[in-house]
Structures are given as C-alpha cells and as structure tokens.
Interface confidence: low
C-alpha cells in the first residue's frame, strides 16, 4: 500500500491521543534502555510503511501484536485516514483469523514495540528538517 495520500495530521492526532499511551502501557515495566532502535524511516509515508510492517506482519518470535490495543487503533486510524487502505487489508485480515496464535508477550515483541515507538516519534517530527 502507498501511504502517500494519507491525512498525516489526523493520524498524528490519533497517535498522540491514544496510540502512544497504548504503546507505553504495553511496554510498562520495561526499561527504556533495554532496546536499541535499529529501524528508521525517512519521511511520513515511509514511516507508516514501516509501522504497518512491524505492527501487522508476524515475525520470528513475535506473532501476536495485531490483536493488541495499539495495533487495533493503528489499523482503525489507517483505515479512516488512508484512502483505500482497508480494501488492501481484507485478505491479510482473513489469513490472520485462520492463524489465531496464542497471545504471549515475548521479549521479541517488546523489542518490536520499542522499535514502533521510535518510528511513531519519527513520523511525528518531520519538522526537524525545516529550517
């Protein structure tokens, strides 16, 4: 999906009002120094591409993020503010329902959500690039 035509300010508002708090809740009890940020993004569409990938694509050691509160709110925000996004996700959602993995918070998931926090912060700060 090409995130170029999303309403970035609306997505930013959704992040600031709820998604950011849900990410913090998920990470509660984890030291901020525990994970290094290894994933970056260069502009807002790129950030959303990386955010979508880390949030919804199962990875080795972490298959359960898509059912978390922050993930559901991320999906809702993208569906509302990115034209045509929900249509591209129908097949992926059906495939995910068939898997229905057990919900476990692994260290790998915590690391992945730490990366997500960094990507969201970067999404919110393109202003640094403006002189």
């Amino acid at each position: 999906y090409d995130f170029t035509n999303c309403d970035f300010e609306k997505i930013k508002a959704a992040y600031l009002s709820t998604i950011s708090k849900d990410l913090i809740t998920y990470m509660s009890g984890t030291k901020s120094t525990e994970f290094n940020n290894t994933v970056s993004c260069s502009n807002r569409p790129h950030c959303l591409t990386e955010i979508q990938s880390l949030t919804f694509n199962p990875t080795a050691g972490c298959a359960s993020l898509a059912k978390e509160m922050f993930a559901m709110k991320t999906k809702a925000a993208l569906a509302i503010w990115c034209p045509g996004y929900s249509e591209t996700q129908i097949n992926a959602t059906q495939a995910m329902k068939k898997r229905r993995k057990r919900k476990v918070t692994t260290n790998k998931c915590l690391e992945q959500v730490s990366q997500l926090q960094g990507l969201w912060r970067r999404f919110n700060r393109p202003l640094l690039k403006q002189q």
Partner: antibody, heavy 117, light 111 residues
C-alpha cells in the same frame, strides 16, 4: 559494523574551497542522516550541518552561505564543500551518523584540515 | 539557536569519587515527553563517543557508572565511581531542533 571514514586534503590555501568525503559502511544513507561537526585545535565541537536520509539538508546559519553537503547513496559517500576558507577554518572535521532520535551515535576518526598559505 | 552552558569548565575528582557535570539550555529541549539532550566523551586525539542519549539512556557498551538526568533546561551527567580511564572532555548536545548545538565542554582530571 557501522563505520565512517573522512578523507580530506590536509592543507588548503586561504580563499580556496575545502572538499571532504565521508565514506560509510554498515548502514544505508537512505535510512539515516549524516552530520558534519568540526573542532578547531584546542577548542570545542561545532555542528556544521546535516544531510538527511531523504536527501534534504540543514546548515548552521553561520555557514549557510558557503557550505554545501551532498551525497551519493549508491557509493555510500557524503560530501562536504566549504568555500572561501580562512585561517580560522583550521580544524578537525568529523562526519557522524545520526540516529532515529537525531543524536550522533557513531563518529568518524576525523580529518585534520589546515588553512595556510 | 539553543545555547548550552556547561559547568564547570574543568574539574578534578579523586579516583572512586563522584564527578558531576551540569548543562543548562537557553530553552527547553523537551518534545512529547522526551528530553533531547545527549552527552559525549572525547579523549585527546580521538573522536567524540556517545555516552548518554535522550537525557538518561545509556548507550550500548558504556559502563553503568555513567548516568544522565534532567529535563526541560537543566541536565546533569554523573560519573561514579570515577576511574582513571574517565579522564577526558565531556560535551552536552541538544538534538531537539536544528541547528544542533554543543556545550563548551568540561575537562575531567582524575586526582
């Protein structure tokens, strides 16, 4: 392993231009920004400018009229060009990788530039 | 531009004691709950090395005797217990807005 290596001319005559190349490895210039910082002998660190992952730049206002930072992503190289050099531009010039939070997590060893006739 | 005022300019600390370095910013470097203040160590003839990022986060591979604290405009770097190898110049740097700026440096001598 992330590495940056500066290569410069060493000696530049006053009023001439300085060109330094920063060659990076272990990361992609399309994912992270590269900053230039200089340090005159016996003095502190001075930020010159940055070229971001998407190719946009920011320059320190004190250098904006004579500084240019460009890059070649395919060659993993970043270029600094500083025009109209004076003796007080004598310094060690460093390139440094920017992190996702914009601090400088890896630095090159630096290249010493002397401006003298 | 954000001006960073570091103090003291130099200090001498006995081996095993605590070294405290202050950095005051001319305006807040906080953004969305993060304090974008960083600390670097530079030894003679070497390039700077990142110690602490975003006010209090210890860079990977840096000994736990280094710690950072503060928010808004007032920040502190603590080294305890000080070791011989900590003799160096320490710089604070803000990454909250461009132009990025550094403090003038604090030279630490071990007695």
């Amino acid at each position: 392993q992330v590495q940056l290596r500066e290569s410069g001319p060493g000696l530049v005559a006053p009023s001439q231009s300085l060109s330094i190349t920063c060659t990076v490895s272990g990361f992609s210039l399309t994912s992270y920004g590269v900053n230039w910082v200089r340090q005159p002998p016996g003095k502190g660190l001075e930020w010159l400018g940055v070229i971001w992952d998407d190719g946009t730049t920011n320059y320190h206002s004190a250098f904006i009229s004579r500084l240019s930072i460009t890059k070649d992503n395919s060659k993993s190289q970043v270029f600094l060009k500083l025009n109209s050099l004076q003796t007080d531009d004598t310094a060690t010039y460093y390139c440094a990788k920017g992190s996702i939070y914009w601090y400088f997590d890896v630095w090159g060893a630096g290249t010493t530039v002397t401006v003298s006739s | 531009d954000i001006v960073l005022t570091q103090s003291p300019a130099s200090l001498a600390v006995s081996l095993g004691q605590r070294a405290t370095i202050s950095c005051k910013a001319s305006q807040s470097v906080d953004y969305e709950g993060d304090s974008h203040m960083n600390w670097y160590q530079q030894k003679p003839g070497q390039s700077p090395k990142l110690l602490i990022y975003v006010a209090s986060n210890l860079e990977s591979g840096i000994p736990a005797r280094f710690s950072g604290s503060g928010s808004g405009t007032d920040f502190t770097l603590n080294i305890h217990p000080v070791e011989e190898e900590d003799a160096a110049t320490y710089y604070c740097q803000q990454s909250n807005e461009v132009p990025f700026t550094f403090g003038s440096g604090t030279k630490l001598e071990i007695k």
